[in-house]
């Protein structure tokens, strides 16, 4: 954690007044995920990089504010600074993944989360009270709410799975957390299978 | 034990600025919300917004979005709220407060009196 | 917005009796698992304190003397007996949807 907002800082730091400008207008436009809301235009035009960094950061998380600044960096034709930020990502990701992978286990990779996928899309029943326990700490207000909105608590799941490739190892831990707190034995289940 | 402590009164002029704190302590400041809520004198209550300290992620109720802003700094496990262009009409008491799982307000400080007179 | 609307605005009770606040939202604010309304307790001078959260369930420390009841768009807090020490102003408060709102209060008198 941090490491991204810094990267996201020097990047717009970088840009001269005209660029951050256009970049401003660029981000009044660009393709969001579903689930995330858009910074209103008043408050965003009045920015300076470390206010807009913060405000970015705060309305995306660093994950994929990151990848947000990525791509309207690279639809600038800014491709050096992109791939700055994209080295940066890359290594964040390393680190999350090493962090990640049990000492005595190589047969086994990545995360909990990532390897129970759709044994916990299946069994998770109490989907609300997990939101509640990621709300604002992992998931923003949309998409906790996009995220209740669906009827059945599979929809829930695989809505909530939709958000997790943007996650680092702390989200995914945050919700392992949760899981444990609401389901112990499914997660006790789950991890002896 | 959970404590949430505010700065003290303030008395401040028309147009102006204000900042006041809000400093946590007996649990992990990172993990919560905390939220603030503006009371006039013999009135309701009226939500601000929140901000979660881990990440900086804020939200504002629309009717406060051009008046208030919210920061925290993790190193000394304190959140800030600042409220900007100021009119009799910011004169109330603001009370920060903890959200607890299902965003109730479990821990509430013992509140800010602003008052903005000429 | 959603609106919580409290009734009665005042009421009195006698020591012993019980005391009956209703909290109406303008919406449904229950999903299949919980209901995002809360209760507080103010008196003067003093910041609100939570009594119940999530629609029934008591915070530690508050008396069992305090229930809250409800799902959808209609909660209820009944306090009985009531004590001497109960006279204040009593707050509802969702967090359904962003802005979370406040019921307008209900003073509570004593007999």
């Known amino acids: 954690m941090g490491r991204a907002r810094d990267a996201i800082l020097d990047a717009l730091e970088n840009l001269s007044g005209d660029e951050l400008k256009k970049f401003k207008m660029k981000l009044l436009t660009v393709q969001l995920r579903e689930g995330y809301g858009r910074i209103p235009r008043g408050a965003l035009l009045q920015m300076d990089a470390i206010d807009l960094t913060d405000k970015l950061v705060s309305y995306y998380l660093e994950s994929y504010g990151l990848e947000l600044t990525m791509t309207v960096l690279r639809d600038m034709g800014l491709q050096e600074l992109a791939e700055q930020l994209q080295t940066t990502k890359e290594e964040s990701g390393a680190v999350a993944a090493a962090a990640s992978v049990p000492a005595q286990s190589t047969a086994r990779t990545g995360h909990f989360v990532d390897q129970h996928r759709q044994a916990l899309i299946a069994r998770v029943t109490e989907v609300d009270g997990v939101l509640d326990a990621l709300h604002g700490s992992v998931l923003t207000e949309g998409q906790y709410q996009a995220v209740r909105a669906e009827t059945t608590s599979q929809d829930k799941m695989r809505k909530l799975f939709s958000f997790v490739p943007s996650w680092n190892l702390t989200c995914k831990d945050s919700l392992l957390q949760a899981l444990k707190e609401i389901h112990p034995y499914l997660v006790m289940d789950l991890e002896q299978s | 034990e959970v404590q949430l402590q505010q700065s003290g009164a303030e008395l401040v002029r028309p147009g102006s600025s204000v900042k006041m704190s809000c400093r946590t302590s007996?649990?992990?400041?990172?993990?919560?919300?905390i939220t603030w809520v503006k009371q006039r004198p013999g009135q309701g209550l009226e939500w601000i917004g929140y901000?979660?300290?881990?990440?900086?992620?804020?939200e504002y109720n629309e009717k406060f979005k051009d008046k208030a802003t919210l920061t925290s700094d993790t190193a000394s496990s304190t959140v800030y709220m600042q409220l900007n262009s100021l009119t009799s009409e910011d004169s109330a008491i603001y009370f920060c407060?903890?959200?607890?799982?299902?965003?109730?307000?479990?821990?509430w400080a013992q509140g800010t009196t602003l008052t903005v007179s000429s | 917005d959603i609106v919580l609307t409290q009734s009665p605005a005042s009421l009195a009770v006698s020591l012993g009796q019980r005391a009956t606040i209703s909290c109406r939202a303008s919406?449904?604010?229950?999903?299949?698992?919980?209901?995002?309304m809360h209760w507080y307790q103010q008196k003067p001078g003093q910041p609100p304190k939570l009594l119940i959260h999530?629609?029934?369930n008591l915070e530690s420390g508050v008396p069992a003397r305090f229930s809250g009841s409800g799902s959808g768009t209609d909660f209820t807090l009944n306090i009985h007996p009531v004590e001497e020490e109960d006279a204040a102003t009593y707050y509802c408060?969702?967090?359904?949807?962003?802005?979370?709102?406040f019921g307008g209060g209900t003073k509570l008198e004593i007999k």
């Open positions: 007996g649990y992990t400041f990172t993990n919560n919300g």
């Open positions: 901000i979660y300290v881990g990440n900086g992620y804020t």
């Open positions: 408060q969702h967090s359904w949807e962003l802005p979370y709102t």
């Open positions: 919406k449904s604010v229950s999903s299949s698992a919980y209901s995002y």
């Open positions: 407060a903890r959200l607890d799982r299902g965003r109730a307000l479990d821990y």
């Open positions: 999530l629609a029934s």
